[in-house]
Amino acid sequence: IVLRPSRVHNSEENTMRALTLKDILNGTFSYKTFFPNWISGQEYLHQSADNNIVLYNIETGQSYTILSNRTMKSVNASNYGLSPDRQFVYLESDYSKLWRYSYTATYYIYDLSNGEFVRGNELPRPIQYLCWSPVGSKLAYVYQNNIYLKQRPGDPPFQITFNGRENKIFNGIPDWVYEEEMLATKYALWWSPNGKFLAYAEFNDTDIPVIAYSYYGDEQYPRTINIPYPKAGAKNPVVRIFIIDTTYPAYVGPQEVPVPAMIASSDYYFSWLTWVTDERVCLQWLKRVQNVSVLSICDFREDWQTWDCPKTQEHIEESRTGWAGGFFVSTPVFSYDAISYYKIFSDKDGYKHIHYIKDTVENAIQITSGKWEAINIFRVTQDSLFYSSNEFEEYPGRRNIYRISIGSYPPSKKCVTCHLRKERCQYYTASFSDYAKYYALVCYGPGIPISTLHDGRTDQEIKILEENKELENALKNIQLPKEEIKKLEVDEITLWYKMILPPQFDRSKKYPLLIQVYGGPCSQSVRSVFAVNWISYLASKEGMVIALVDGRGTAFQGDKLLYAVYRKLGVYEVEDQITAVRKFIEMGFIDEKRIAIWGWSYGGYVSSLALASGTGLFKCGIAVAPVSSWEYYASVYTERFMGLPTKDDNLEHYKNSTVMARAEYFRNVDYLLIHGTADDNVHFQNSAQIAKALVNAQVDFQAMWYSDQNHGLSGLSTNHLYTHMTHFLKQCFSLSD
């Protein structure tokens, strides 16, 4: 199916131009989305182009400024947050990035009633995390790894924890591995629905081995960055969950929530916390061997001022074919009775679907079913459940929003988005106001992205929030590549692929082929989304065919494909890329002497292994920030898929699946290896070991390091990186500069 039809006609050809690398590096064709900052059922805030904070009222159709750009500028604020009682706004400035989600900042509290900043008992700086209570204007914040509470912004703080210590004890914020691989947030504290209680995690990293790397900076001596980072098989953080009554915090102090006995018997993780009511909380735990997850519902005992987690309220989720969940174990969405909930997990046929759990998981009622997957539950109201799935027309790389009426029997299902803008929009997400009175739909493609506002009862479109008109106009004279999403059936495996073809593509001609690969467990590369990026340029200007293939281990097509790679990373992902390349050659328009592969992170690992597969298919390839041995990567991620690197578990495959073990096989390919020296995620160590193995095997290769750059290679490094990779590929494919 052709997703982005070419607008090229002979009469227009003279005025049309190809994409340039400069276009990509300048972000000329980037798009905007609009996510309302909901503050009620019918109101949202949005930061206007001139930086005013504006309140929009959907029902009146009116808007007004609640915070002027003058106020924002007075403290150089880049972000804001309105207190639920609408009396105060926090203004965030001096943003300083730490890891993927975490950052520190300076916070100022502005009183909307009097138009002045709150003076007296100002917040310390820099703060690691700050948030309002869900009701009123209490503040919780983390400073120097300790949690503080303010009843009102101008009040003195109450210190909740005292043991916080850099790189040792983390309160209310995750350590490196929990941030990156488990919580995927910068915070580890959660207010109860009405702000009565505050739950928080304490992470003890005292015994975790430390990764140390040089940060060169501008000084005479480099700094050493030290991060407690558990690699596969290493000592893990010790986690504890506490809850404190924020009304009388000094009364009994923080109370620890007990860990289920079957979890506490060996190493374990805390995976998420969901408040149900002010006096009921749901915690999810996971064994270190991540095929057993326990969901535990705990109740506040007024008499003892403690939290009780009866065994009858423990729900076990176990996988016998792989790990528990998809990338993460899914979180529950509770219904109005405050005990039953909706949750996505594998059904008996091995597809992830929504289930309704009333008493036990064994008695769960399956809500969705089919050879497709439910992906996210957005909202449950009294009468509707909104979710996304890839059911429509059997394309795994699409996302549509559905509504199931749970108030009526039998429940009826309606696709809210399937037929809205069918050609333009096949990949949606949604954002709901209180009680799902209204919602915003954000369409990511395959056409130009568009964000729209809808009535939560009728699903009627109310208005367009962002339609990227400027982008549409800018693209009018650009020769964009054609894109198609199709599938290959090979040995009972379905391999979906996206092919990006030059604008004047002619099947009778031969083109160089570049495979772009990620291929990590539970990932998906073949998606019906809009993008004008580096590979668009390579197709448009340099005449390459680019292909992305979702092989075994990828997501949203059932457990058989997903769990195929369990305990065997680096085997089937590579095989499936190679199989796809052979199929592409059979199509007749690929120049088999000019085939390359490239990838970043997990994709760098797969591209390296593919180049070293000994097939002779690839002339050249690039690995950016690759993993080279699973012994070098984080415990939480690696062990989920590989088990432990011990003799009695899976050490053999850990050793067999390294890039270094295949050093000899790089002799007949051109290899470009790239890594940032300050990569906190996939450590530079990975590429250092590849380089050492290649040198020891006397294999020639090319390399580029980016000093003081992390896993994202951002800023000026990005420009240098893509320019460098472009030169490498053009040389490999004998394309003139």
Partner: nanobody, 118 residues
Framework: QVQLQESGGGLVQAGGSLRLSCVVS????????MGWYRQAPGKRRELVAS???????NYADSVKGRFTISRDNAKSTVFLQMNSLKPEDTAVYYC????????????TYWGTQVTVSS
């Protein structure tokens, strides 16, 4: 054009009562959260009471138990019933959206003067 017109202020003795009214035009009152604010001479403006679209209310600590905010959506009017008035309640009382519209208050809103004598 949205307009807010306050009335009901006046001079009253300590312990007395007043009922302030705010007629809202140019918008749908029922869809807006509203607030009563006040500013005493030489003091900062402060929120006295607010009422959300679902009718839930919020009060400044200094007026809790004495003042009551309410609304009559049919009449597009927001009220502030003030009982057991104290001299420190003396101020100009303004009606506004909640959170308030950012404007120069003096220019836009006349307010209504409440003076409590001892």
């Amino acid at each position: 054009q949205v307009q807010l017109q306050e009335s009901g202020g006046g001079l009253v003795q300590a312990g007395g009562s007043l009922r302030l009214s705010c007629v809202v035009s140019g918008t749908i009152l029922s869809s807006n959260s509203m607030g009563w604010y006040r500013q005493a001479p030489g003091k900062r403006r402060e929120l006295v009471a607010s009422i959300s679209t679902d009718g839930s209310t919020n009060y400044a600590d200094s007026v809790k138990g004495r003042f009551t905010i309410s609304r009559d959506n049919a009449k597009s009017t927001v009220f502030l019933q003030m009982n057991s008035l104290k001299p420190e309640d003396t101020a100009v009382y303004y009606c506004n959206f909640h959170p308030p519209v950012v404007r120069d208050w003096g220019d836009t809103y006349w307010g209504t003067q409440v003076t409590v004598s001892s």
